[in-house]
């Protein structure tokens, strides 16, 4: 025998009150699937969370942050506030990137600057707490009668700071 | 029930203060940090200032920083907002909001209705 929630669609939930019917979701609850016995609560963007998507009948709403939080976890369960460039977060809030260390985005850790010399390159650009280092060519490349000047190589695996 | 109540809202002239309270109950006040947020007309919701558990203040609002301050008062399971220097774009409704921690909320974080603050010029 066919269990007749099954042609219950998404939506709807198969009310045992009433012989089995199939009823529309409440307001503010959804089933995104067909069959359900029950719908769900829809979440509730609230405070710092913002909606992104409203709840329907058959999908639950979605949240994402308002400006100056950024998303964590799964379908965003979390809120994590941003820090400036040139900081990073610890558990007393933002603070700067130490001296030799540098985070380019408004989360994240600060990274120390690249070692060019571990490259055998000269650095060609100071770090800054915004900014990795730009290394140069190597002290080779720079001595007369070198040909060509070898362009910047793209920032490695972070070193140590410069000397 | 846990609950989150806003008070102290209202009409107030350019330059003037207020103190904005959230009185908390139903849960351990002393655990939580205590975070204000305002939505103005027409705009998105923004963080103005927090309180850790332990008492330290987090600006989320370079704007308010030299007006508004943050205090709680664990007896009083109460947070106050301290506004002075009001400005017109201060014109918003101020909610609180429960977090673990002033850098982390999350989606079952605890949250007030809100007070509205008017500041006309």
């Known amino acids: 025998l066919q269990d007749p929630c099954s042609n219950c669609p998404a939506g709807t939930f198969c009310d045992n009150n009433r012989n089995q019917i199939c009823s529309p979701c409440p307001p503010n609850s959804f089933s995104s699937a067909g069959g359900q016995r029950t719908c769900d609560i829809c979440r509730q963007c609230k405070g710092v969370f913002r909606t992104r998507k409203e709840c329907s009948s058959t999908s639950n709403a979605e949240c994402d942050c308002t400006p100056g939080f950024h998303c964590l976890g799964a379908g965003c369960s979390m809120c994590e506030q941003d820090c400036k460039q040139g900081q990073e977060l610890t558990k007393k809030g933002c603070k700067d990137c130490c001296f030799g260390t540098f985070n380019d985005q408004k989360r994240g850790i600060c990274r120390p600057w690249t070692n060019c010399s571990l490259d055998g390159k000269s650095v060609l650009v100071n770090g800054t707490k915004e900014r990795d280092v730009v290394c140069g060519p190597s002290p080779a490349d720079l001595s007369p009668g070198a040909s060509s000047v070898t362009p910047p190589a793209p920032a490695r695996e972070p070193g140590h700071s410069p000397q | 029930q846990v609950q989150l109540q806003e008070s102290g809202g209202g009409l107030v002239q350019v330059g003037g203060s207020l103190r904005l309270s959230c009185a908390a109950s139903?849960?351990?006040?002393?655990?939580?940090?205590i975070g204000w947020f305002r939505q103005a007309p027409g705009k998105e919701r923004e963080g103005v200032l927090c309180?850790?558990?332990?008492?330290?203040?987090?600006y989320y609002a370079d704007s308010v920083k030299g007006r508004f301050t943050i205090s709680r008062d664990n007896a009083k399971n109460t947070v106050y907002l301290q506004m002075t220097n009001l400005k017109p774009e201060d014109t918003a409704v101020y909610l609180c909001?429960?977090?673990?921690?002033?850098?982390?909320?999350?989606?079952?974080?605890?949250w007030g209705q809100g007070t509205q603050v008017t500041v006309s010029s």
């Open positions: 309180i850790s558990s332990s008492g330290g203040s987090t």
């Open positions: 139903g849960f351990t006040f002393d655990d939580y940090a």
């Open positions: 909001g429960a977090p673990r921690d002033c850098s982390r909320y999350s989606s079952d974080d605890y």
